[in-house]
Interface confidence: medium
């Protein structure tokens, strides 16, 4: 048991508890509320949150548990509206007395539905789709013969790709998939399709065979 | 009607302290960030400090930094400028003011130019 | 900081004439200026925002153009009304706002 000195008694101290899971997954447009409890003595003199190296100069609230002159426990709360796909990452709260500091960090990810970035046909034949959202979006292919409008033979990809997994996981994943479209002999439609938990994303190749094989494309929602 | 009336302005000595008041009328006063601004005789214009919307942020002008304080009681509709340690070069009119809603921005909430003012309350610093 | 700089610092015109008052940011403010209109004794009142737009109540006569670091507020036709001092703002950093030195127009 180490031994306490005299003056160590009055050290002040701030711990800070979080009243949410520090980890937090948050649909795009919805709205989230941080929310930190902390015992501070001496009094709190500063507080502020922060995300990507800038403070919030509004948007937060802090205040007192109890008006007891005795009461050393505040709450600290940011209120973040309409979050977009962009705002994921690492929001910080930071609290200070005059003897410590003290910090807790809330990563946000926001689920976003698939968007298709690019759809094309490559030079070697291959038809290519790039679709980015959280969670990691997953991207099949189907070919609908003639003028069918429901896509059901699935085909296989010949390559997948993430392109950005090396990075921080709070922004869009984005994924890149390929397959050959020499395997198409008739005319009709090949859906790539990106989906994930928040919604899905089609894009469509027209194959219309004339003298040369020409896909024309359009995109869904 | 949107109003802003000051009260709490008078004369103090050099070291002494005062405490503005500024009441808010017609408009969700817990919405708004709000500011002090001040003017001494024969000068312009001087921002002096600022509080978000919840009070839970605020800014100051370095020539009051350690010295006023800015709060806010949007139960009360009321601004506060706390002002200690006062000097002969914070005699002034005092003016609160309203920041407009005219932009948004992710860190900041919602800001702008100050489109509602008080008609403001003299502070005098002098033994 | 940003210092915000008018000129010139006193104008002297007559009823009719047109006014021309300047103002310049140490750096760019992008389109967030505001110019206000005080007279003695009575709440500045707020005139032009976002540079060129003009708030509720600003008679037409009166004109912003500007972005950046240079702006300009225009009179158009002067009326014995607009004696009064005149202030820049920027309001581009949103929790630390600066003033101009302001101008005195007169209308003899």
């Known amino acids: 048991q180490p031994s306490v000195s005299p003056g160590e008694v009055d050290k002040g101290f701030i711990n800070i508890f979080p009243m949410i899971n520090t980890t937090v997954f948050v649909n795009d447009g919805e709205n989230v509320d941080l929310i930190v409890e902390y015992e501070a003595f001496p009094k709190p003199e500063h507080q502020q949150w922060i995300y990507m190296n800038r403070t919030f100069t509004d948007k937060w609230e802090d205040y007192p548990k109890s008006e007891n002159e005795s009461n050393i426990r505040y709450v600290s709360e940011l209120h973040l509206t309409r979050l977009k796909g962009t705002e994921g990452g690492t929001y910080t709260f930071l609290v200070s007395n005059s003897d410590v500091n003290a910090a807790i960090a809330f990563n946000v990810y926001v689920n976003t539905k698939p968007e298709i970035l690019t759809y094309d046909r490559l030079v070697n034949g291959m038809l290519q789709c790039v679709a980015a959202g959280f969670p990691e979006p997953t991207i099949d292919w189907y070919f609908c013969p003639g003028t069918e409008q429901r896509c059901s033979a699935s085909v296989l990809p010949v390559d997948v790709q993430t392109l950005n997994s090396s990075g921080p996981p709070f922004g869009k994943l984005v994924v890149q998939s390929s397959i050959d479209s020499s395997a198409f002999k008739h005319n009709g439609t090949v859906e790539c399709k990106a989906y994930n938990d928040v919604g899905k994303t089609s894009a469509y190749f027209n194959f219309a065979f004339k003298e040369q094989i020409h896909p024309h494309h359009h995109h869904h929602h | 009607e949107v109003q802003l009336l000051e009260s709490g302005g008078g004369l103090v000595q050099p070291g002494g302290s005062l405490r503005l008041s500024c009441a808010a009328s017609?408009?969700?006063?817990?919405?708004?960030?709000m500011q002090w601004v001040r003017q001494a005789p024969g000068k312009g214009l001087e921002w002096v400090s600022y509080?978000?919307?919840?009070?839970?942020?605020?800014s100051y002008a370095d020539s009051v930094k350690g010295r006023f304080t800015i709060s806010r009681d949007n139960s009360k509709n009321t601004l506060y400028l706390q002002m200690n340690s006062l000097r002969a070069e914070d005699t002034a009119v005092y003016y609160c003011?309203?920041?407009?809603?005219?932009?948004?921005?992710?860190?900041?909430?919602?800001?702008?130019?100050?489109?509602?003012w008080g008609q403001g309350t003299m502070v005098t610093v002098s033994s | 900081d940003i210092q915000m700089t008018q000129s010139p610092v006193t104008l002297s015109l007559s009823p009719g004439d047109r006014a021309t008052l300047s103002c310049r940011a140490s750096?760019?403010?992008?389109?967030?200026l505001a110019w206000y209109q005080h007279k003695p004794g009575q709440a500045p009142r707020l005139l032009m925002f976002?540079?060129?737009t003009r708030a509720i109540g600003t008679p037409d006569r009166f004109s912003g153009s500007g972005s950046g670091t240079e702006f300009t507020l225009t009179i158009s036709s002067l009326q014995s009304e607009d004696s009064a001092v005149y202030y820049c703002?920027?309001?581009?950093?949103?929790?630390?706002?600066?003033f101009g030195q302001g101008t005195k127009l007169e209308i003899s």
């Open positions: 750096q760019s403010v992008s389109f967030n």
């Open positions: 976002d540079a060129s």
């Open positions: 017609g408009f969700t006063f817990s919405n708004y960030k």
């Open positions: 003011a309203r920041v407009a809603h005219q932009y948004y921005d992710f860190w900041s909430g919602y800001y702008g130019a100050f489109d509602i």
């Open positions: 703002q920027q309001y581009n950093y949103p929790a630390s706002y600066t």
């Open positions: 509080i978000s919307s919840s009070g839970g942020y605020t």
